[in-house]
C-alpha cells in the first residue's frame, strides 16, 4: 500500500506571455498521494470550474484560457491540497501582449498659417507602442516646431505652408506595426496681393488691361470694383497656377475711374480680404468728352457595381474631401459622357474607367492601389475605342470640346506598368479578356498605328494580332 504523501508542485508556474485572442496555458504538475484537489485563482479570486472562458484539465493541473483578453492580465496561482500536510501553492503572471492598435487615428485638418496644429494618434498595445509619423513618403523629423507628444499626437507650432501634405502615424512594438490611414493637413493662408494693378493715363477710347495677382490657400477669388460699384463693362480673364490667381481686367476707356482689386478667401466661416487700387485717367480729358497616399475599402457605389468584382476592395483618394462621394460623382459624370460612344467602345471604356477611378487594392507591404495594366489601357485606346480616341485627340488639337470622351478621367497608358514586366504590378480587365475570346471580327480601325501593333493581351485564340516589336516597358 502506498504511503500518504503531501502535495509537491514539481513544475512551478512561470510567467506566460500571450497575445489577445490567443490561448494561454499554465501548468501546475503535482506529485502526491492521495490525488490532490487543485484549485486556481486569479489575483487571489477563485476561478470557477464552470467558467466557460477557462478549461481545466489533467485533474486540475492544466489551466487554459481559451481566448485571452486584455483584462486577463494578472497573477494566477494553483493550490494543491490532499489532506496530508498543508496546501501548497505556486503562482505565475500572465502578461497579455498586444499588437499595436491605433485607437484614435488622425483626421484631416485645415489650419491657418501661423497657428498650432495637433494631429491625434492614440494607441494601445503591450509593450507600449512607440509612435512615429510619416509625411508624404518620408519619416517626419522633429524640430523646434514639430514634436511627437507623449500621447503619440503630432504637434506643429507656427504652421507653415510647407507643413501641408499627407500624414500618417505609425505605431510599432515588438509584435508588429499599425499604420493610420493617410490624413491631409491643409494649411490655409490669408489672401495677399502679390502684384497690385498699375495706374494708367490713357487717351479716350483706348483699351487698358489692369492686372492683379493674389496668393492664398485656398486660392482666393478676385473681384473688381469700379468707383465703388461692381465693374459693369469690360472682360475678365483669370488663370490659376501654384495657388496664385492672376486676374486681368480689360477695359474700353471712356471715362476716368478708380479700380479696386479685391482678393478674398474663406477659412471656415470667416473670410480674409486684401485690396489694391489703381486709377485710370484720360489724357486731356477736359477737352475730349469722348486680362494630387488614401485608403482601401469595399466599393459601395452603384455606377461601377456591375463592372468591379463583388465586394471589391478599392482605393479611395483622400485628396478629395469626401473620397467615396467624389469618386462616385466623377464616374457618374463619365458614365453620362459615354452615352455618345459606340456599342463596341462603351463597355470597354466603362471597364477601363471604373478600374482606373476605383483601383483594386493589393496587399503586400500595406494595401495600396494597383493601376490598370498598360496592355489593357492600350487595348481600349487602340482597339475598342480607336475611333473615339482619334476623334477626341483631333478635337483637342482643334480646341473643340463638345461630346464623346474628352471629359473622361482616362489614364495615360504610357504611365501604367506592363503586365509583361510584372504581372502582379497591375490590374487586368476581365471584360476585355472575355471579349477577345468571343469577338471573332472587329470593325476596321483607322488608327495612327499599324493594325499589327494592337497590344499584346494574355495569349489565347483571339483575333488580336500581336507584333513582337510592340515595346511594353
Amino acid at each position: 500500500e502506498k504511503l500518504p504523501k503531501a502535495p509537491v508542485i514539481t513544475t512551478p508556474l512561470e510567467t506566460v506571455d500571450a497575445l489577445v485572442e490567443e490561448v494561454a496555458t499554465f501548468m501546475c504538475a503535482v506529485e502526491s498521494y492521495p490525488q490532490p484537489e487543485i484549485s486556481w485563482t486569479r489575483n487571489k479570486i477563485l476561478i470557477k470550474l464552470f467558467d466557460t472562458r477557462y478549461s481545466i484539465r489533467e485533474n486540475g493541473q492544466l489551466l487554459t484560457i481559451l481566448s485571452v483578453e486584455d483584462s486577463d492580465d494578472g497573477i494566477y496561482c494553483c493550490i494543491a491540497n490532499n489532506g496530508v500536510g498543508g496546501a501548497v501553492e505556486s503562482c505565475g503572471a500572465l502578461q497579455v501582449k498586444m499588437k499595436p492598435k491605433i485607437t484614435r487615428p488622425p483626421i484631416n485638418v485645415k489650419i491657418i498659417e501661423g497657428l498650432k496644429a495637433v494631429l491625434p494618434c492614440t494607441t494601445m498595445g503591450n509593450p507600449k507602442p512607440s509612435v512615429s509619423w510619416i509625411k508624404g513618403d518620408n519619416a517626419l523629423r522633429e524640430n523646434s516646431r514639430i514634436a511627437v507628444l507623449e500621447s503619440g499626437s503630432l504637434r506643429i507650432h507656427n504652421v507653415q505652408k510647407e507643413d501641408a501634405g499627407q500624414y500618417r502615424c505609425v505605431a510599432k512594438n515588438s509584435l508588429g506595426t499599425a499604420y493610420s490611414k493617410l490624413v491631409k493637413l491643409e494649411v490655409e493662408v490669408f489672401a495677399r496681393i502679390l502684384r497690385a494693378p498699375e495706374s494708367h493715363n490713357v487717351t479716350f477710347g483706348s483699351f487698358v488691361t489692369l492686372r492683379c495677382t493674389a496668393i492664398g490657400i485656398p486660392v482666393p477669388t478676385i473681384s473688381w470694383i469700379e468707383n465703388g460699384n461692381a465693374v459693369s463693362s469690360g472682360s475678365i480673364q483669370e488663370s490659376v497656377k501654384d495657388r496664385v490667381i492672376d486676374s486681368r481686367l480689360q477695359l474700353f476707356i471712356t471715362k476716368p475711374g478708380l479700380y479696386t482689386c479685391i482678393a478674398t478667401n474663406k477659412h471656415g466661416e470667416k473670410f480674409s480680404t486684401a485690396k489694391a487700387a489703381a486709377t485710370v485717367s484720360i489724357a486731356e480729358w477736359s477737352k475730349s468728352q469722348k486680362d494630387s497616399q488614401g485608403y482601401c475599402a469595399q466599393y459601395r457605389g452603384e455606377v461601377c457595381d456591375a463592372v468591379l468584382a463583388k465586394d471589391a476592395l478599392v482605393f479611395f483618394n483622400t485628396s478629395y474631401r469626401d473620397p467615396e462621394d467624389a469618386q462616385e460623382l466623377l464616374i457618374h459624370t463619365a458614365w453620362n459622357e459615354l452615352k455618345a460612344v459606340s456599342p463596341l467602345c462603351r463597355p470597354a471604356a466603362e471597364a477601363l474607367l471604373c478600374n482606373h477611378l476605383f483601383q483594386e487594392c493589393s496587399p503586400g507591404v500595406v494595401p495600396t492601389p494597383m493601376p490598370i495594366c498598360r496592355e489593357y489601357c492600350l487595348a481600349v485606346k487602340e482597339l475598342f475605342c480607336a475611333k473615339e480616341w482619334q476623334a477626341m485627340e483631333g478635337k483637342a488639337h482643334r480646341g473643340l470640346y463638345r461630346s464623346g470622351m474628352h471629359l473622361l478621367p482616362v489614364p495615360e497608358c504610357s504611365k501604367l506598368p506592363s503586365m509583361h514586366r510584372d504581372p502582379t504590378a497591375c490590374t487586368r480587365l476581365p471584360y476585355l479578356d472575355y471579349k477577345k475570346e468571343n469577338i471573332t471580327t472587329f470593325p476596321s480601325i483607322t488608327s495612327s498605328r499599324p493594325s499589327a501593333d494592337i497590344p499584346n493581351l494574355p495569349a489565347s485564340t483571339s483575333s488580336f494580332a500581336v507584333s513582337p516589336a510592340y515595346s511594353m516597358t
Epitope: 510619416i134 513618403d137 497616399q293 469595399q298 468584382a309 465586394d311 471589391a312 476592395l313 483594386e360 487594392c361 493589393s362 496587399p363 503586400g364 507591404v365 500595406v366 495600396t368 494597383m370 504611365k415 501604367l416 506598368p417 506592363s418 514586366r421 510584372d422 504581372p423 502582379t424 504590378a425 516597358t473
Partner: antibody, heavy 115, light 113 residues
Framework: EVQLVESGGGLVQPGGSLSLSCVAS????????MNWVRQAPGKGLEWLSV???????YYADSVKGRFTISRDNVKNTLYLQLNNLKPEDTALYYC?????????WGQGTQVTVSS | EIVLTQSPNSVTASVGEKVTINCKSS????????????LNWYQQRPGQSPRLLIY???TQQSGIPDRFSGSGSATDFTLTINSVQPEDAAVYYC?????????FGQGTKVELK
C-alpha cells in the same frame, strides 16, 4: 529585355559598411516595385526589403535599422546600403523586380563579411 | 510573420514521373475581396538565379512550360511537375507576397535518377 545588374559586393570586416547598386534596363523603372533578396552559401532564399513606386521602403526584421533601400528613377538604379555588417550577412545579394511576386532576378553580387 | 513550410525536403524522380511539392502557410494568404492567393513558386537551378514559375497560386508565368502547375488556396498549396524532365533538377521555393515581411519556404530539392 529586362536586365538587372548588381554591383558593389565584396569582402568587408564585421561592423563595416557596403553599398550595393542595381542598374535596371528594358523597362520603365519608376513604375515598378523593387526588392532585395539574399541567399547565404548553401542556404535558402531570404527576402530583405522592398521599395514602392513612391520610394516608401519596408524591411525584414533581420536587417531593419542596418540596411537602407533607395532608388534613383532618373538613373534607373536601385541601392542597398549595408551598415554594421555581421558574419551572418555573408550571402549572394539579388536585386529583384516585383510587387507581390518576385518576377525578374539579377545575377546577384557576393557580400562576404569576415575578419 | 507568416511561416511557410514545404514538404518534402527532397524528392528523387525518374524522367516522365509526376512530382508534387506542398507548401503550408501559418496564416491565410488569400484576400477575401478578390479571392486571390498571394502565393508564388520559384525554381532555382544549380548556380543560377531563381526564376518565377507560378504566381497567385495557380497562374503560370509566361515562358514557363505547361508541365508546371500550381493549385491550392488559403493556407495549403501545391506545385505539380507533370512528366519531370532532366532540366527540372533544381530547388523549388514557395513564397508569400501577402504580408510584409515576405517569406520563403525552406526549399524542396528535386533530383533525377
Amino acid at each position: 529585355e529586362v536586365q538587372l545588374v548588381e554591383s558593389g559586393g565584396g569582402l568587408v570586416q564585421p561592423g563595416g559598411s557596403l553599398s550595393l547598386s542595381c542598374v535596371a534596363s528594358g523597362f520603365t523603372f519608376s513604375l515598378y516595385y523593387m526588392n532585395w533578396v539574399r541567399q547565404a552559401p548553401g542556404k535558402g532564399l531570404e527576402w530583405l526589403s522592398v521599395i514602392d513606386t513612391h520610394s516608401i521602403a519596408y524591411y525584414a526584421d533581420s536587417v531593419k535599422g542596418r540596411f537602407t533601400i533607395s532608388r534613383d528613377n532618373v538613373k534607373n538604379t536601385l541601392y542597398l546600403q549595408l551598415n554594421n555588417l555581421k558574419p551572418e550577412d555573408t550571402a549572394l545579394y539579388y536585386c529583384v523586380l516585383g510587387r507581390t511576386a518576385l518576377v525578374r532576378w539579377g545575377q546577384g553580387t557576393q557580400v562576404t563579411v569576415s575578419s | 510573420e507568416i511561416v511557410l513550410t514545404q514538404s518534402p525536403n527532397s524528392v528523387t524522380a525518374s524522367v516522365g514521373e509526376k512530382v508534387t511539392i506542398n507548401c503550408k502557410s501559418s496564416q491565410r494568404v488569400q484576400l477575401g475581396s478578390n479571392q486571390k492567393s498571394y502565393l508564388n513558386w520559384y525554381q532555382q537551378r544549380p548556380g543560377q538565379s531563381p526564376r518565377l514559375l507560378i504566381y497567385y497560386a495557380s497562374t503560370q508565368q509566361s515562358g514557363i512550360p505547361d508541365r508546371f502547375s500550381g493549385s491550392g488556396s488559403a493556407t495549403d498549396f501545391t506545385l505539380t511537375i507533370n512528366s519531370v524532365q532532366p532540366e527540372d533538377a533544381a530547388v523549388y521555393y514557395c513564397q508569400q507576397g501577402y504580408s510584409a515581411p515576405f517569406t520563403f519556404g525552406q526549399g524542396t530539392k528535386v533530383e533525377l535518377k
